[in-house]
Interface confidence: medium
Amino acid sequence: MVLEVSDHQVLNDAEVAALLENFSSSYDYGENESDSCCTSPPCPQDFSLNFDRAFLPALYSLLFLLGLLGNGAVAAVLLSRRTALSSTDTFLLHLAVADTLLVLTLPLWAVDAAVQWVFGSGLCKVAGALFNINFYAGALLLACISFDRYLNIVHATQLYRRGPPARVTLTCLAVWGLCLLFALPDFIFLSAHHDERLNATHCQYNFPQVGRTALRVLQLVAGFLLPLLVMAYCYAHILAVLLVSRGQRRLRAMRLVVVVVVAFALCWTPYHLVVLVDILMDLGALARNCGRESRVDVAKSVTSGLGYMHCCLNPLLYAFVGVKFRERMWMLLLRLGCPNQRGLQRQPSSSRRDSSWSETSEASYSGL
């Protein structure tokens, strides 16, 4: 799901190319947004559309299943705890919810890519908004976790633990509220639009060019650059403090969170680089032509697929990097009476069974 111009004079296809496409051709235009006439038709999209048709449904279906199972397992492990969740675990629970909600929309986008949007404008708005809410939420919650760790370790300030438990909940609510705000354009401008040339209906934006560019810049800054900067800053300071204090156990405990952040950066950087290229084309800093547009469309599909993979990656990272998560997962399976799990009883039980699987009482990760 890869998700235009107010009151302009006529631009036709040749002029559009020459003027760096003030009317961007492969996107939706609001017929009531512009009282202009007869602009360039869109570039041929045969290659990118055929690529999407072949690539996206399979990828989205796989990510849907993996994301649902993985994040379901994370939520189950966290919610099975008898004690109150630590601040980081609370953020991780919200992150699992965000990732689950995001992957829940993937089957809809798979159908959209494979055939067309058959779910109507209402669901188009909801699915688009849900998708973006959880895209932003995932990034912002990771930033919250890093800031929480930063306060705990660098400043020895256990902001959420010492304060009322409501503080972490309020932070999460603020994140969700902010994400809802970011998703307002989806509720307003997304609609099921019949594409005359393709003879198919797709869930698309229907607003002016300037709005589209602004939304992309917002996505780039709020959904990627800002969270990544927060994470990089916080973890650089955390690592510096831990290295100075020679806290080997603490350094080991940081492994999970560092891997999670690196995974976020690796998964989302390619997509946002492609979005940056698209923004530069919108702004006229890069000339837009049909060849480049087609390459950008395909790159967007591939890199967004890599980005959505991040939703499924966190649970795998917890499972393979975080020992405590594995322990609690086994214990949960045992409690549920899973067969063929007798060998699990020989697993060493945690000395801090009721402490978080993501942080210790020393306010650092005990991912090992």
Epitope: N12, S36, C37
Partner: antibody
Framework: EVQLLESGGGLVQPGGSLRLSCAAS????????MSWVRQAPGKGLEWVAT????????YYPDSVKGRFTISRDNAKNTLYLQMNSLRAEDTAVYYC????????????????WGQGTLVTVSS | DIQLTQSPSFLSASVGDRVTITCRAS?????LYWYQQKPGKAPKLWIY???TLASGVPSRFSGSGSGNEYTLTISSLQPEDFATYYC?????????FGQGTKLEIK
């Protein structure tokens, strides 16, 4: 059913004026850009004028610029072409045509045409 | 202005024949549009975006091409296909039409 009905054609002397009308029905007139296209007897098609859906923008080829004025009355679902300083070479059947919308944007081709009205400029 | 030159201007063919009409542009265009016109009638949109058939156009018609050369092909000519065909571009203002190709019964 989309219908475009031209009227106002007739015989006029060179230098004279004429106003053509096109009554539209069967679609939301206010949502579409409209044009006039003409065809001289036994000749090909020539685009004459275009107006945006709200009437803000008008477009003309050099051959008629300054002499012809396209306008619309969205309340009456009517398109107009005011032709001044008419010349013999303006003799043609004048068609009113609708621009389709692709992705909410007006396209420069024509999906519906009226039956045309004949304008003869002769002394 | 972009000039569109259709060839041939006149074409005599028989029912069942495969017919190709060519439209050459004086400079490159992104898409081409075709109209069919019968005597005393208004033109009808026939093919848009180079190759997409307008509503109600039989599948024996096809459009193709890119850049400076475009073609309209009728795989098996039928009696109702005898008419004049015009190509049109709107890559560059003014929007221009070809001079037309009159398809006649041999």
């Amino acid at each position: 059913e989309v219908q475009l009905l031209e009227s106002g054609g007739g015989l006029v002397q060179p230098g004279g004026s004429l106003r053509l009308s096109c009554a539209a029905s069967g679609f939301t007139f206010t949502s579409y850009a409209m044009s006039w296209v003409r065809q001289a007897p036994g000749k090909g098609l020539e685009w004459v004028a275009t107006i945006s859906h709200g009437g803000t923008y008008t477009y003309y080829p050099d051959s008629v610029k300054g002499r012809f004025t396209i306008s619309r009355d969205n309340a009456k679902n009517t398109l107009y072409l005011q032709m001044n300083s008419l010349r013999a070479e303006d003799t043609a059947v004048y068609y009113c045509a609708r621009h389709p919308i692709y992705s909410g944007n007006y396209q420069g081709y024509f999906d519906y045409w009226g039956q045309g009205t004949l304008v003869t400029v002769s002394s | 202005d972009i000039q569109l030159t259709q060839s041939p201007s006149f074409l005599s063919a028989s029912v069942g024949d495969r017919v190709t009409i060519t439209c050459r542009a004086s400079s490159g265009v992104n898409y081409l549009y075709w109209y069919q016109q019968k005597p005393g009638k208004a033109p009808k949109l026939w093919i848009y975006f180079t190759s997409t058939l307008a509503s109600g156009v039989p599948s024996r018609f096809s459009g193709s091409g890119s850049g400076n050369e475009y073609t309209l092909t009728i795989s098996s000519l039928q009696p109702e296909d005898f008419a004049t065909y015009y190509c049109q571009q709107f890559t560059s203002s003014p929007y221009t039409f070809g001079q037309g190709t009159k398809l006649e019964i041999k």
